[in-house]
């Protein structure tokens, strides 16, 4: 039975040209996290594998940085980066947990960031 829950940064906004941290946290389960995939729509951005570490898609390697933790840092943001991002936790024996983050990249310099997510 899957008992875990994913907490995410939720809906966030950032300035064009700036950077943002996408963060998810899996709690309430003792399942082993074997891999976390970060996706934008149906595009794979990055993988963090428990055994083999981080892998960043060649298409995004100049603008995506691993971490902190299992999170992902997006850099040099453009308005085209606006959209849904998903953290997909592959666990054993529970299976898959998915978290959703909506990022809005604003032209304005008055972009208000959502409350920053803190990992306990």
């Amino acid at each position: 039975m899957m008992t875990g829950t994913i907490e995410t940064t939720g809906n966030i906004s950032a300035e064009k040209g700036g950077s943002i941290i996408l963060q998810c946290h899996l709690s309430s389960t003792t399942a082993q996290v074997t891999q976390v995939n970060w996706e934008q729509q149906d595009q794979l951005l990055a993988i963090c594998n428990a055994d083999l570490g981080w892998h960043i898609s060649p298409s995004f390697k100049d603008r995506v940085a691993p971490g902190p933790g299992l999170g992902l840092t997006l850099q040099s943001l453009t308005v085209n980066d606006t959209g849904e991002y998903f953290c997909i936790y592959h666990t054993y024996p529970d299976g898959t947990y998915t978290g959703r983050i909506f990022l809005e990249v604003l032209e304005s310099s008055v972009a208000e960031h959502g409350a920053r997510f803190q990992i306990p």
Epitope: T34, Q35, N37, E39, D42, Q43, L44, I47, N49, D51, L52, G53, H55, I56, S57, P58, K61, H90, T96
Partner: antibody, heavy 121, light 108 residues
Framework: QVQLVQSGAEVKKPGASVKVSCKAS????????MHWVRQAPGQGLEWMGI????????SYAQKFQGRVTMTRDTSTSTVYMELSSLRSEDTAVYYC??????????????WGQGTMVTVSS | EIVMTQSPATLSVSPGERATLSCRAS??????LAWYQQKPGQAPRLLIY???TRATGIPARFSGSGSGTEFTLTISSLQSEDFAVYYC??????????FGGGTKVEIK
């Protein structure tokens, strides 16, 4: 040209171990993942695990955890797969296969010729 | 683990005809899917990677399509050398990387 050459066929008794080698040539050995896949007679393909030849990091299928060990020798561009506590169900052809670059992921573009391992008392 | 399901298990086709093979993933693998061909007594050979990109030296009659969970391998006009077993594989989540059970393409 790029190729993977595996060691020869083996016959083992139940409970024994087998170590299969896979020598790579024609490319930069540490730059690509190496996988091991097996195929029992008349059956499909079964992934066993992966090794990063540069760092020696490994990841194994749960089914083989504790019984399989993958290692590499960068000086000879060779990877090894050792399977212990053999049983009759381990009778299969064992393949090494080159995966994607260690910076990303990829399909298996080069395969060894296969090594037949027979487990019989 | 991601379960890959291929259909049909066996496909009987006449030479020159079109063959359509299906592969379904139990969860999205984006476009991180490969197709392999295997003939008796031989190692598998990579045909398609990235769901739709032909590997080096693979004839244009082989084409792949799909994304997410549904994928198709099409052989536009079967040649005698195309009769073999075909496997799909996801290579985005491990352990374990997983293969489909295979589709045997046989002469009708």
């Amino acid at each position: 040209q790029v190729q993977l050459v595996q060691s020869g066929a083996e016959v083992k008794k139940p409970g024994a171990s087998v170590k299969v080698s896979c020598k790579a040539s024609g490319y930069t050995f540490p730059a690509y993942y190496m996988h091991w896949v097996r195929q029992a007679p008349g059956q499909g393909l079964e992934w066993m695990g992966i090794i990063n030849p540069s760092l020696g990091l490994t990841s194994y299928a749960q089914k083989f955890q504790g019984r399989v060990t993958m290692t590499r020798d960068t000086s000879t561009s060779t990877v090894y797969m050792e399977l212990s506590s053999l049983r009759s169900e381990d009778t299969a052809v064992y393949y090494c296969a080159r995966g994607g670059r260690t910076t990303w992921i990829g399909a298996f573009d080069i395969w060894g010729q296969g090594t037949m391992v027979t487990v019989s008392s | 683990e991601i379960v890959m399901t291929q259909s049909p298990a066996t496909l009987s086709v006449s030479p020159g005809e079109r063959a359509t093979l299906s592969c379904r993933a139990s969860q999205s693998v984006s476009s991180n899917l490969a197709w392999y061909q295997q003939k008796p007594g031989q190692a598998p050979r990579l045909l398609i990677y990235g769901a739709s990109t032909r590997a080096t030296g693979i004839p244009a009659r082989f084409s792949g399509s799909g994304s997410g969970t549904e994928f198709t391998l099409t052989i536009s006009s079967l040649q005698s050398e195309d009769f073999a077993v075909y496997y799909c594989q996801q290579y985005v989540v491990w352990p374990p990387l997983t293969f489909g059970g295979g589709t045997k393409v046989e002469i009708k």
